[in-house]
């Protein structure tokens, strides 16, 4: 009876369990009743990082110097190239596909620490009583306006992104 499932590092094809290709190799031809799976090593700038049945290897990532990228770790037949940014620049994501001088803190967040050559901007959420309505790499959260000190009253409550709105007190006649 033909198998319906195969062992680890095997795959089912034509009612038969074939060995997967090891990392660093691609599939040339499936196994048959009489032959083993045929695999070939990936080329110079290619890789496959899992046991696989891929017919094409993946291209190594290109660390584009025009985007401020450089090679942190050269790729092998089993691993992709790892890019990083030039000194003083910071990756925009874990995958490090582009570089920024520093990131900005979004509205509702203030700058806790300005970026340096080694660390990116550190943002913190604006606590109650403070707000930030801008995207900035240097501005802290600002305190809400104190309406009382201006002899006014709060007409609209503040949020982490907006200041309070002050207005005149209702005068009793």
């Amino acid at each position: 009876e033909p198998p319906t499932a195969c062992r680890e590092k095997q795959y089912l094809i034509n009612s038969q369990c074939c060995s997967l290709c090891q990392p660093g190799q691609k599939l040339v031809s499936d196994c048959t009743e009489f032959t083993e799976t045929e695999c070939l090593p990936c080329g110079e700038s290619e890789f496959l990082d899992t046991w696989n049945r891929e017919t094409h290897c993946h291209q190594h990532k290109y660390c584009d110097p025009n985007l401020g990228l450089r090679v942190q770790q050269k790729g092998t037949s089993e691993t992709d190239t790892i890019c990083t940014c030039e000194e003083g620049w910071h990756c925009t994501s874990e995958a490090c596909e582009s570089c920024v001088l520093h990131r900005s803190c979004s509205p509702g967040f203030g700058v806790k620490q300005i970026a340096t050559g080694v660390s990116d901007t550190i943002c913190e959420p604006c606590p109650v009583g403070f707000f930030s309505n801008v995207s900035s790499a240097f501005e802290k959260c600002h305190p809400w306006t104190s309406c009382e000190t201006k002899d006014l009253v709060v007409q609209q409550a503040g949020t982490n992104k907006t200041d309070v709105v002050c207005g005149p007190q209702d005068r009793l006649r």
């Epitope: 940014c85 001088l101 990131r103 790499a137």
Partner: nanobody
Framework: EVQLLESGGGLVQPGGSLRLSCAAS???????EMWWVRQAPGKGLERVS?????????YYADSVMGRFTISRDNSKNTLYLQMNSLRAEDTAVYHC?????????WGQGTLVTVSS
């Protein structure tokens, strides 16, 4: 296409002054926070000064506080850095930068050399 063109650098004696300019094009200048960043020979990047879009709030690194003044003219799409009481350690290539501060917006910069 975003372009930032720095100018105004040169050779100046210690204690002297220079005014750097950054002419911006390809984006709505008045909407963006702007920075001056410098790189001394063989050293890393140092964030010198920043200014908010309206020009009402500024930031200065401790190393330039009280000597440098950042400003902007939104009608001329230009950022400025007035540098007074210059020191040898201010020698660097000065760059302006805009949000989102990506590498492909990075200009050539303008070289400031402070030497007697």
């Amino acid at each position: 296409e975003v372009q930032l063109l720095e100018s105004g650098g040169g050779l100046v004696q210690p204690g002297g002054s220079l005014r750097l300019s950054c002419a911006a094009s390809g984006f709505t200048f008045r909407d963006y926070e702007m920075w001056w960043v410098r790189q001394a020979p063989g050293k890393g990047l140092e964030r010198v000064s920043a200014i908010n879009p309206q020009g009402t709030r500024t930031y200065y690194a401790d190393s330039v506080m009280g000597r440098f003044t950042i400003s902007r003219d939104n009608s001329k799409n230009t950022l400025y850095l007035q540098m007074n009481s210059l020191r040898a350690e201010d020698t660097a290539v000065y760059h302006c930068a805009k949000e989102p501060y990506s590498y492909d917006y990075w200009g050539q910069g303008t070289l400031v050399t402070v030497s007697s």
